[in-house]
């Protein structure tokens, strides 16, 4: 029987800068029941607070609701593991909520084959940003990535769209059915999951771009 091993806070995520959750990985339990507590203080403060919500994020997590979340302030947090034989502390983790946003996937993905008379045909892809993200304030810059592949292909073709919410693709295989998905990330944050796939049938008379 031993004191607990050192825990590690290994991930923090926010869907929208208004709330966030951090998760830790326990160290060894020393063969005894072990209690974990997360304490934190904000940059420039000395007053320590305990995690406000150990439930919402699941096991080994701390959730910070709206009233506990402030942007532009660094949170300095650590986890304490305690059993009958003693305690151990994680390294301190410095967290700025502005940098840990992982948005929901983009919405309303629409895909269409365009065949203008005077130009080469192309695949036109359009989407909307996720609803929880407020782009109007300028606090967010969302970057987008598209992936597509013929239905039976193994490899995805990836296109970086920057801040655009629409994109044209010229080189496609005629007669094939394609899957198209889009995802987004803040300029300093994490990629969303891919949106649900949209399927599009490429006409057999679609002319490949040179």
């Amino acid at each position: 029987q031993l004191p607990p091993g050192k825990p590690e806070i290994f991930k923090c995520r926010s869907p929208n800068k208004e709330t966030f959750t951090c998760w830790w990985r326990p160290g060894t339990d020393g063969g005894l029941p072990t209690n974990y507590s997360l304490t934190y203080h904000r940059e420039g403060e000395t007053l320590m607070h305990e995690c406000p919500d150990y439930i919402t994020g699941g096991p080994n997590s701390c959730h910070f609701g709206k009233q506990y979340t402030s942007m532009w302030r660094t949170y300095i947090m650590m986890v304490n593991a305690t059993n009958q034989m003693g305690s151990s502390f994680s390294d301190e983790l410095y967290v700025d909520v502005t940098y840990i946003v992982q948005p929901d996937p983009p919405l309303e993905l629409a895909v269409e084959v365009k065949q203008p008379e005077d130009r080469k045909p192309y695949l036109w892809i359009k989407w909307s940003p996720p609803t929880l993200i407020d782009l109007k304030t300028g606090w967010f810059t969302l970057l987008y990535e598209i992936r597509l592949k013929p239905e039976k292909a193994a490899e995805w073709e990836i296109h970086f769209a920057g801040q655009q919410t629409e994109f044209k693709i010229l080189s496609l295989h005629p007669g094939q059915k394609y899957l198209v998905q889009v995802r987004c990330k803040p300029d300093h944050g994490y990629w969303s999951a891919w949106s649900p796939a949209t399927f599009i049938q490429i006409p057999s008379d679609f002319t490949m771009n040179d």
Epitope: F10, C12, G44, T74, Y94, V95, D96, Y99, I100, Y190
Partner: antibody, heavy 120, light 107 residues
Framework: QVQLVQSGAEVKKPGSSVKVSCKAS????????MHWVRQAPGQGLEWMGE????????NYNQKFKDRVTITADKSTSTAYMELSSLRSEDTAVYYC?????????????WGQGTLVTVSS | DIQMTQSPSSVSASVGDRVTITCKAS??????VAWYQQKPGKAPKLLIY???NRYTGVPSRFSGSGSGTDFTLTISSLQPEDFATYYC?????????FGGGTKVEIK
Amino acid sequence: QVQLVQSGAEVKKPGSSVKVSCKASGYTFTTYWMHWVRQAPGQGLEWMGEIDPSDSYSNYNQKFKDRVTITADKSTSTAYMELSSLRSEDTAVYYCARNGGLGPAWFSYWGQGTLVTVSS
Amino acid sequence: DIQMTQSPSSVSASVGDRVTITCKASQYVGTAVAWYQQKPGKAPKLLIYSASNRYTGVPSRFSGSGSGTDFTLTISSLQPEDFATYYCQQYSSYPWTFGGGTKVEIK
């Protein structure tokens, strides 16, 4: 404890490439951005670029954009910096540096440095 | 790119002295400034982040202040182990840039 261990010194010819490695231990590699900073002999520090090891998303200093490639191998917790088309002014100590937290780019842990000498 | 201009480039001081190093940014950077200490042949070591926050384990004799474009690192009572070169760094906008360094030498 957190450690960043870099590969050994290199001597390279002008026009060639160098790839420096930085093996991380003592923390979860994918949690923090990793940066590369260089220092020419007797000179100051110059930021080259950064990578998020969780998804290999990277940003570069435009000064090096066409010559530098930063990669990360999650399976070995190792970051790499490759600099191509080497010239004598690329002679420097190259450091990897871990982001201080989940936040802006200040650097709390540094590798020991790798001296790259470019000479014909 | 944002230029970070440090002054002085070197300073001679004695143990116990108060030393002040300044850093001026060419554009507004808010409080997105860090300070590092570097000894010969070693990697830099973080002292201050967000202009005024001491990093874990950094002695209280080191303090940082300033916002906007003008920043200061102060060593309140210089110790023998503080003789080194000090760098400021901005992380407000890409590319992240460092000052030219200030060498603190023994008088």
